[in-house]
């Protein structure tokens, strides 16, 4: 079938990074600067997309394959494509219909983007809190209290690094 | 309800220096994206310098190294100091603030301040 196809379509043995040029007798030429096509057996090639202004070229265009975009720092992409820039927040923050928010007690974001998420409850797992949780950072959970009672054996974990104004409970 | 507004336009020689203000009064806008763009006569209106709520700033190519964007959250207020003024930037510089995105259609705008530099 795909000899057949081939001997009907010329067109079809163009290989990607190529077009099928109808002006010279369908020979297979080169994309020209600043284009590309990312499949075999195409008539045209596709524009590069130019990554201006608040965009910047993560990845260049080649002749099988488009350019890539990211944005300015301080700024993420959204959309398909990264068709849009949308700010980052600080570690702490979550991005609302009111721009970036602190996080709400009893949830934390380490990250600058995404959203803040409840600290771990311990107890859950038969813990204890180690180091208290912020903005920032989740809680810390130690051994359950019966690891901790007298004559039970077990390794104490290196202090953590705490943050000012938070000490265990 | 939101409402910006533009002040510090004006006319100035080319190579001089003029400061806009923007006083954004009904919202704290301390966590918004907050911009300045300009439009020139028969022009689209295009993205001249923005500030994310944590400071990061983006200038178009043709400010770089003359614009200085700046914002005050204590006094709600964001600031343009344009140095080293050229005739091409004369336009109506209007500011505009967004809860989230760099680009595209901003939430808020101003009214609009008049800058023209002459030769």
């Known amino acids: 079938f795909e000899r057949t196809r081939s001997l009907q379509d010329p067109c079809s043995n163009c290989p990607a990074g190529t077009f099928c040029d109808n002006n010279r007798n369908q020979i297979c030429s080169p994309c020209p600067p600043n284009s590309f096509s990312s499949a075999g057996g195409q008539r045209t090639c596709d524009i590069c997309r130019q990554c201006k202004g608040v965009f910047r070229t993560r990845k260049e265009c080649s002749s099988t394959s488009n350019a890539e975009c990211d944005c300015t720092p301080g700024f993420h992409c959204l959309g398909a494509g990264c068709s849009m820039c949308e700010q980052d927040c600080k570690q702490g923050q979550e991005l609302t219909k009111k721009g970036c928010k602190d996080c709400c007690f009893g949830t934390f974001n380490d990250q600058k983007r995404g959203i803040c998420r409840p600290w771990t409850n311990c107890s859950l797992d038969g813990k204890s809190v180690l180091v208290n949780g912020t903005k920032e950072r989740d809680v810390v959970c130690g051994p359950s209290p019966a690891d901790l009672s007298p004559g039970a054996s077990s390794v104490t974990p290196p202090a953590p690094a705490r943050e000012p104004g938070h000490s265990p409970q | 309800q939101v409402q910006l507004q533009e002040s510090g336009g004006g006319l100035v020689q080319a190579g001089g220096s003029l400061r806009l203000s923007c006083a954004a009064s009904g919202r704290t806008l301390s966590g918004y994206v907050m911009g300045w763009f300009r439009q020139a006569s028969g022009k689209e209106r295009e993205l001249v310098a923005a500030?994310?709520?944590?400071?990061?700033?983006y200038y178009e190519d043709s400010v770089k190294g003359r614009f200085t964007i700046s914002r005050d959250n204590a006094k709600n207020t964001m600031y343009l100091q344009m140095n080293s003024l050229k005739p091409e930037d004369t336009a109506v510089y209007y500011c505009a603030a967004d809860p989230r995105r760099l680009t595209g259609l901003y939430d808020y705008w101003g009214q609009g301040t008049q800058v023209t530099v002459s030769s």
């Open positions: 500030i994310s709520s944590g400071g990061s700033t």
